[in-house]
């Protein structure tokens, strides 16, 4: 089939990095600068992506593959193939339309990106809070008070009135 196709269509012989030039009797011409073709048999070359401004070049464009970008320090990639760069925030913050804002009480973010997430509610799993949550860290749940045999642990269960580390309901 491939042999038959190549007899019918001279363009199918053009390898990656070239295009089938209709202006030159369908001969295979190299892709011009700033363009590429990643597959054979193409009638045009695609324009190389330009990693400029907030974007940095991670991989240069070649005649057979597109450039790849990442983001300048202080920003991180979003979207397929790093199509956008979003501002980093500090741990304990999330990015809003008004910029980086601290996580509300009862939530945390341990990364420079993404949103603040509620602390784990230890009591839902029948456990108690071993280490309190902060804006940067989730609570650490420990065994439930009933599981603790006398002298097995020095952790004092929190007062039942308000258990630190619960998400606000």
């Amino acid at each position: 089939f491939e042999r038959t196709r190549s007899l019918q269509d001279p363009c199918s012989n053009c390898p990656a990095g070239t295009f089938c030039d209709n202006n030159r009797n369908q001969i295979c011409s190299p892709c011009p600068p700033n363009s590429f073709s990643s597959a054979g048999g193409q009638r045009t070359c695609d324009i190389c992506r330009q990693c400029k401004g907030v974007f940095r070049t991670r991989k240069e464009c070649s005649s057979t593959s597109n450039a790849e970008c990442d983001c300048t320090p202080g920003f991180h990639c979003l979207g397929a193939g790093c199509s956008m760069c979003e501002q980093d925030c500090k741990q304990g913050q999330e990015l809003t339309k008004k910029g980086c804002k601290d996580c509300c009480f009862g939530t945390f973010n341990d990364q420079k990106r993404g949103i603040c997430r509620p602390w784990t509610n230890c009591s839902l799993d029948g456990k108690s809070v071993l280490v309190n949550g902060t804006k940067e860290r989730d609570v650490v749940c420990g065994p439930s008070p009933a599981d603790l045999s006398p002298g097995a642990s020095s952790v004092t269960p929190p007062a039942p009135a308000r258990e630190p580390g619960h998400s606000p309901q």
């Epitope: 330009q50 401004g53 920003f75 199509s83 956008m84």
Partner: antibody, heavy 121, light 110 residues
Framework: QVQLQESGPGLVKPSETLSLTCTVS????????WTWIRQPPGKCLELVGY???????SYNPSLKSRVTISIDTSKNQFSLQLNSVTAADTAVYFC???????????????WGQGTTVTVSS | QSVLTQPPSASGTPGQRVTISCSGS????????VNWYRQLPGTAPKLLIY???QRPSGVPDRFSGSKSGTSASLAISGLQSEDEADYYC???????????FGCGTKLTVL
């Protein structure tokens, strides 16, 4: 179709601050660069600076000490402030969209109509 | 003084082909694609050619662009009276981290 509209005073006194706002309509301000370009009477186009939707900025080195560009994605607006203006800052100021560097290739492809700013006492 | 150099004027008669040149350096045209803009009096520039030789939809194929080394050129064939305008080249400049422009070429159709 995306449209851009500049707004701000047409007359600014020497040594004062030039403030312009560009409102983006018909599309999102996200994932593009937003640019200010100026054209003094009978002279060349000059990039003032640009801001990426997520806050990255870059300014023309010759203006860097006097210029600030900011963005408000909730209002679909971006703004230019140029301090300590002189008569040499008299120009038509264009706001423009630039999709260069993401997955776009066009560069500065959408322009506002331009607003004339005169620096005079 | 502009970073990209263009002739201040060019002219031709209807039906003719005219070429406008744009010269730069390795930090702009030499390393990056070139755009061309057309500006009518009292209006904003309009994108005519992007990425050296690509036409946005709506731009007739009478307009073509090319680039070699640190120079670029815009060719207009079948010149028409409505082509009378200012034409600007632009390229990203790596050392400035931004766009640089030519000072424009005023095209007159005789």
């Amino acid at each position: 179709q995306v449209q851009l509209q500049e707004s701000g005073p047409g007359l600014v006194k020497p040594s004062e601050t030039l403030s312009l706002t560009c409102t983006v309509s018909g599309g999102s301000i996200s994932s593009y660069y937003w640019t200010w370009i100026r054209q003094p009477p009978g002279k060349c186009l000059e990039l003032v600076g640009y801001i990426y939707y997520s806050g990255y900025t870059s300014y023309n080195p010759s203006l860097k000490s006097r210029v600030t560009i900011s963005i408000d994605t909730s209002k679909n607006q971006f703004s230019l402030q140029l301090n300590s203006v002189t008569a040499a800052d008299t120009a038509v100021y264009f706001c423009a969209r630039d999709d260069y560097g993401g997955n776009g290739y066009y560069g500065v492809d959408v322009w506002g109509q331009g607003t004339t700013v005169t620096v005079s006492s | 003084q502009s970073v990209l150099t263009q002739p201040p004027s060019a002219s031709g008669t209807p039906g003719q082909r005219v070429t406008i040149s744009c010269s730069g350096s390795s930090s702009n045209i030499g390393n990056n694609p070139v755009n061309w803009y057309r500006q009518l009096p009292g209006t904003a520039p309009k994108l005519l050619i992007y990425s050296n030789n690509q036409r946005p939809s709506g731009v007739p194929d009478r307009f073509s662009g090319s680039k070699s080394g640190t120079s670029a050129s815009l060719a207009i064939s079948g010149l028409q009276s409505e082509d009378e305008a200012d034409y600007y080249c632009a390229a990203w400049d790596d050392s400035l981290n931004g766009w640089v422009f030519g000072c424009g070429t005023k095209l007159t159709v005789l």
